[in-house]
Interface confidence: medium
C-alpha cells in the first residue's frame, strides 16, 4: 500500500475538499461539451485529504451531511482517499482564495468487463481543473457493492445512498498534472509533468505520450511490460520514476516548433485508464535590426525583425529630435512575411526617414509574447547637407 | 554547408580603391542573411565595415564616411567590397562574413591588403 | 559608437584552472556575443546571444551578463583553449569588438 506523506516543515493535516460539479447524466454524449440540459448540478467531498497547513486551515471544519440543502439539491459524492494520493490538494482547497476556479465533471466510468462484474459496483470519474494553467486532476470512484436492501436508493443514479444522502465512493486511480499549458524557447528542454497514484492491488500496465496538433496525432513516447519507447528523437521519460515515485513525466530536449501542440498522457492500470491533455507552446523571441536602404534626400529606414515564433508582433517607430523626445511615427509599411525551415517568422517594417534640420534618431521597437520587454534598434539619420 | 571566399589584389597604391570580391557557395545571398566586410588591423583589432543584406539593403560604419560601397550580383552570389582613397592605415586582413541571425557565423578566411607605393 | 573594453588583456591559466573574462560596453546591450580567434585564422563563432554555445563548443565554455556587463568563463582550463576572444555587439550600430583577451597556457 501506498504511504501518506510524512509531516514536513508545517503540518499534515486531514481536510474535507468540497467541490462543486456537474454529473453528466447517462446517455449524455461523453467527449463532448454537454449541454445544460445532459447536465446535472453535482457536489464532490473528498473526505480526510491530507494537505499541509501553512496556518491557513484553522477555520476549516469538516463536511457535514445535511448542509446543503436547497431547493434543487445536488447529488453529492463522497470519495474516500485513502487508497491513494491526492498530491495537489493544496491547489483545489486555497483556488477560490488565490482567484482561481475549478471546474469539475463527473461521469459514470465504464469498465471493459463482464456484466456480472459490472453489476457489483459502479464507477465514476471525475475531471478537476484549476484554471490559470494550474492542476488538472483526473479521478476514478468506486461505489461500494451495490445491494438493493438499502434503506435510500437514488432513483436516477440507480444506487444506494448514505443515511446522509450521499453517494459514497473510494478513489482508486488517480493521473493528475501540475501544469495544463506550458511554454518554453526554441532550442530549449522541456519537462512535460504526469503523475499518478494507484490503489494496492493494481497494476501499471502502460504509458502513453500522444501529441495531437492541427487534426494529426502521433505517438511521442510509450513504456509498456518494462519496456519504454521513444518516437520523438530524445525523448525520456524514467522507468524508475514510474515505479517508485508514479511519475511518468515525459522530458523532450532540443524543442523545435513540431513540438508544439497537445499533449495526451495516459496511464493504464489493470483495471482503469485516465489521462491528463498538457498544451505546450513553443516561442523564440525575435531578433531587429535597423538599417538605411539609401542616402537620397528622403533615406528609408529597414527594420528586419527575424527568427520569432509564434506570429502575433507588433512593431512601432519612434523619432527623437535632438534635445526632444520621442514621438511615434506613422506610415510604415512591411513587407511580405517569410517563414523559415526551423519554422520561425521574419518581416520588414519600412519607413521614409525625415531627419529635419539637425538630424534624428529613430528607434523600430518590436514587441512580442516571448520578450519579457520590447526590443529596439536605434539608428541616426542626418540631414543631407550633414553627410560627408 | 555555407562557404565564403575572398578574393582581390594583395597591394593597392595610397588614394586608389580597395576592390574586393566575396564568393558564397552553399547558400543564396537573396535568400536570407546578411553578408559583411569586416577587417582585422596589424594589431588584431577587429572593425566591422558594413553588409548587404539578402533584400539589398546596405549600413557602413559611419567611420568609413562616404569611401565604401558594398553590392552584390546574385546571378554570380557574390558581394563586393569598395573602399576608395585608402591610405597605408588600411593596411589589414579583409574578412568576408555572413550571419543567420546569429552574428557572423560563416567567415572567409581572409585576405591581406597592404597599402603601399 | 558602443566602444567594448575587454579585461584583462592578455591572462594566462594552467590546465584544469577556472577562467574569466569580461567585457564591459559603453552603452547596454540586449545580447553579448563571443568569437575565439587562433593565430592565422578566421574569428569563429563561440558563445551568441549572451549565453548559447555555438556548435562544436566544449560545454566547459558559458557566458553570462546583462545590459553593460558580460564575461565568458572556461571552468576547466584546457591547451585548446589557447587563443584570443573577442566580444561583439550586435544591438546597435555600428557594430563594434572588443579589443580582444589573448588565452595563453602555462
Known amino acids: 500500500a501506498e504511504t501518506k506523506p510524512h509531516p514536513a516543515e508545517g503540518q499534515w493535516r486531514a481536510v474535507d475538499v468540497v467541490l462543486d460539479c456537474f454529473l453528466a447524466k447517462d446517455g449524455a454524449h461523453r467527449g463532448a461539451l454537454a449541454s445544460s440540459e445532459d447536465r446535472a448540478r453535482a457536489s464532490l467531498v473528498l473526505k480526510q485529504v491530507p494537505v499541509l497547513d501553512d496556518g491557513s486551515l484553522e477555520d476549516f471544519t469538516d463536511f457535514q451531511g445535511g448542509t446543503l440543502a436547497q431547493d434543487d439539491p445536488p447529488i453529492i459524492f463522497e470519495a474516500s482517499v485513502d487508497l491513494v494520493q491526492i498530491p495537489q490538494a493544496e491547489a483545489l482547497l486555497h483556488a477560490d482564495c488565490s482567484g482561481k476556479e475549478v471546474t469539475c465533471e463527473i461521469s459514470r466510468y465504464f469498465l471493459q468487463m463482464t456484466e456480472t462484474t459490472v453489476k457489483t459496483a459502479a464507477w465514476f470519474m471525475a475531471n478537476m481543473q484549476v484554471s490559470g494553467g494550474g492542476p488538472s486532476i483526473s479521478l476514478v470512484m468506486k461505489t461500494p457493492r451495490v445491494t438493493k436492501n438499502e434503506a435510500l436508493w437514488h432513483p436516477t443514479l440507480n444506487l444506494p445512498l448514505s443515511p446522509q444522502g450521499t453517494v459514497r465512493t473510494a478513489v482508486e486511480f488517480q493521473v493528475m498534472t501540475q501544469t495544463q499549458s506550458l511554454s518554453f524557447l526554441l532550442g530549449s528542454s522541456a519537462s512535460l509533468d504526469c503523475g499518478f497514484s494507484m490503489a494496492p492491488g493494481l497494476d501499471l500496465i502502460s504509458v502513453e505520450w500522444r501529441l495531437q496538433h492541427k487534426g494529426r496525432g502521433q505517438l511521442v513516447y510509450s513504456w509498456t511490460a518494462g519496456q519504454g519507447q521513444a518516437v520523438r528523437k530524445g525523448a525520456t521519460l524514467e522507468p524508475a520514476q514510474l515505479g517508485m515515485a508514479r511519475d511518468a513525466s515525459l522530458t523532450l530536449p532540443g524543442l523545435t516548433i513540431q513540438d508544439e501542440g497537445t499533449y495526451i498522457c495516459q496511464i493504464t492500470t489493470s483495471l482503469y485508464r485516465a489521462q491528463q491533455i498538457i498544451q505546450l507552446n513553443i516561442q523564440a523571441s525575435p531578433k531587429v535590426r535597423l538599417s538605411l536602404a539609401n542616402e537620397a534626400l528622403l533615406p528609408t529606414l529597414i527594420c528586419d525583425i527575424a527568427g520569432y515564433y509564434p506570429l502575433d508582433v507588433v512593431v512601432t517607430w519612434t523619432r527623437e529630435e535632438l534635445g526632444g523626445s520621442p514621438a511615434q511615427v506613422s506610415g510604415a509599411s512591411f513587407s511580405s512575411l517569410r517563414q523559415s525551415v526551423a519554422g520561425t517568422y521574419s518581416i520588414s517594417s519600412s519607413l521614409t526617414a525625415e531627419p529635419g534640420s539637425a538630424g534624428a534618431t529613430y528607434t523600430c521597437q518590436v514587441t512580442h509574447i516571448s520578450l519579457e520587454e520590447p526590443l529596439g534598434a536605434s539608428t541616426q539619420v542626418v540631414p543631407p547637407e550633414r553627410r560627408t | 554547408d555555407v562557404q565564403l571566399q575572398e578574393s582581390g589584389p594583395g597591394l593597392v597604391k595610397p588614394s586608389q580603391t580597395l576592390s574586393l570580391t566575396c564568393s558564397v557557395t552553399g547558400y543564396s545571398l537573396t535568400s536570407g542573411y546578411f553578408w559583411h566586410w569586416i577587417r582585422q588591423f596589424p594589431g588584431n583589432k577587429l572593425e566591422w565595415m558594413g553588409y548587404?543584406?539578402?533584400?539589398?539593403?546596405?549600413n557602413y560604419n559611419p567611420s568609413l564616411k562616404n569611401r565604401i560601397s558594398i553590392t552584390h550580383d546574385s546571378s554570380k552570389n557574390q558581394f563586393f567590397l569598395n573602399l576608395n582613397s585608402v591610405t597605408a592605415e588600411d593596411t589589414a586582413t579583409y574578412f568576408c562574413?555572413?550571419?543567420?541571425?546569429?552574428?557572423?557565423?560563416?567567415w572567409g578566411q581572409g585576405t591581406l591588403v597592404t597599402v603601399s607605393a | 559608437e558602443n566602444v567594448l573594453t575587454q579585461s584583462p588583456a592578455i591572462m594566462s591559466a594552467s590546465p584544469g584552472e577556472k577562467v574569466t573574462m569580461t567585457c564591459s560596453a559603453s552603452?547596454?546591450?540586449?545580447?553579448m556575443h563571443w568569437y575565439q580567434q587562433k593565430s592565422s585564422t578566421s574569428p569563429k563563432l563561440w558563445i551568441y546571444d549572451t549565453s548559447k554555445l555555438a556548435s562544436g563548443v566544449p560545454g566547459r565554455f558559458s557566458g553570462s551578463g546583462s545590459g553593460n556587463s558580460y564575461s565568458l568563463t572556461i571552468s576547466s582550463m584546457e591547451a585548446e583553449d589557447v587563443a584570443t576572444y573577442y566580444c561583439f555587439q550586435g544591438s546597435g550600430y555600428p557594430l563594434t569588438f572588443g579589443s580582444g583577451t589573448k588565452l595563453e597556457i602555462k
Open positions: 552603452s547596454s546591450v540586449n545580447y
Open positions: 562574413a555572413g550571419d543567420d541571425w546569429d552574428w557572423f557565423a560563416y
Open positions: 548587404i543584406s539578402y533584400s539589398g539593403t546596405t
